[in-house]
């Protein structure tokens, strides 16, 4: 395993529909053909996996059908979108990139993107 630099934005504001997008960019030290991207949420000292996808270079990311994440890849950049976010999901979202194949294995951990989610105000009832 060798360490690899991963960059991601410091702050992102989710849309009113609870969607947040950010770019995760990694400085690939080798010619990887298979890459694993994981989004982790860190709250206090708890780390949980939000979603993960493995993709072949040049192909699209494939998340599980029930995943709240979608994404596209372009070279050493991954464009990640997280859906269905609510105010309680506000937190630090860390991008982890692993070059899985061929060996050697490389690991990169981003510093995290603070995603702020604000629940939309309910529409007031109107008498018409």
């Amino acid at each position: 395993c060798k360490a690899m630099h991963v960059a991601q934005p410091a702050v992102v504001l989710a849309s009113s529909r609870g969607i947040a997008s950010f770019v995760c960019e990694y400085a690939s030290p080798g010619k990887a053909t298979e890459v694993r991207v994981t989004v982790l949420r860190q709250a206090d000292s708890q780390v949980t996996e939000v979603c993960a996808a493995t993709y072949m270079m040049g192909n699209e990311l494939t998340f599980l059908d029930d995943s709240i994440c979608t994404g596209t890849s372009s070279g050493n950049q991954v464009n990640l979108t997280i859906q269905g976010l609510r105010a309680m999901d506000t937190g630090l979202y860390i991008c982890k990139v692993e070059l899985m194949y061929p060996p050697p294995y490389y690991l990169g951990i981003g510093n995290g993107t603070q995603i702020y989610v604000i629940d939309p105000e309910p529409c007031p009832d109107s008498d018409f």
Epitope: L40, A52, M100
Partner: antibody, heavy 119, light 107 residues
Framework: QVQLVESGGGVVQPGRSLRLSCAAS????????MHWVRQAPGKGLEWVAV????????DYADSVKGRITISRDNSKNTLYLQMNSLRAEDTAVYYC????????????WGQGTLVTVSS | DIQMTQSPSSLSASVGDRVTITCRAS??????LAWYQQKPGKVPKLLIY???TLQSGVPSRFSGSGSGTDFTLTISSLQPEDVATYYC?????????FGQGTKLEIK
């Protein structure tokens, strides 16, 4: 809750083989890198080997390369360590450990299984 | 391979003391460092990862600092149950080497 239970240790003669197993439960086994760490009697901790997710990627300490093979069966949630050409210096407690989500540190450990290589 | 050197190898301190253990890497490892506690006859326990992040459930008297080559584990107020051997471990690249350990005793 996360549980790691090792088995397969015992007394074995130099040059012989042994296979250790680690049964995992309480987490999604295939989502984690898994490791073996050993500790000789009265000594410190020594990392032995790692195997990633689907089992294709592995890494070993120089002290065991060519003699020890790590493998996993994700359908059985089980990690293995095949030890060949055993030497007296392989005598140790062998721990199965789960790698962390943020890197290959070890957030959960099994209770360990003792391997004694002696004639 | 990168070597990890801990100091001191053993130390004795009184209950309530502030205790510091250092770990030095022979090359820079960014913040890819973990600390473990191993009580006599017990399994190692993760205390800190990423040099300074406290593992869930670990008492707040434990803290970690450092980056690059020099790292520190601090116990702000030593308790009797802290008697153990403490290990650092680097995980930036394989092999994931441990320090030789620091044995902590109560005076």
């Amino acid at each position: 809750q996360v549980q790691l239970v090792e088995s397969g240790g015992g007394v074995v003669q130099p040059g012989r083989s042994l296979r250790l197993s680690c049964a995992a439960s309480g987490f999604t086994f295939s989502s984690y890198g898994m490791h073996w760490v050993r500790q000789a009697p009265g000594k410190g901790l020594e990392w032995v080997a790692v195997i990633w997710y689907d089992g294709r990627n592995k890494d070993y300490a120089d002290s065991v390369k060519g003699r020890i093979t790590i493998s996993r069966d994700n359908s059985k949630n089980t990690l293995y360590l095949q030890m060949n050409s055993l030497r007296a210096e392989d005598t140790a407690v062998y721990y199965c450990a789960r790698g962390g989500l943020l890197g290959p540190y070890f957030d959960y450990w099994g209770q360990g299984t003792l391997v004694t290589v002696s004639s | 391979d990168i070597q990890m050197t801990q100091s001191p190898s053993s130390l004795s301190a009184s209950v309530g003391d502030r205790v510091t253990i250092t770990c030095r890497a022979s090359q820079g490892i960014s913040n890819y460092l973990a600390w473990y506690q191993q009580k006599p006859g017990k399994v190692p326990k993760l205390l800190i990862y990423a040099a300074s992040t406290l593992q869930s459930g670990v008492p707040s008297r434990f803290s970690g600092s450092g980056s690059g080559t020099d790292f520190t584990l601090t116990i702000s107020s030593l308790q009797p149950e802290d008697v153990a051997t403490y290990y650092c471990q680097k995980y930036n690249s394989a092999p994931y080497t441990f320090g030789q350990g620091t044995k902590l005793e109560i005076k």
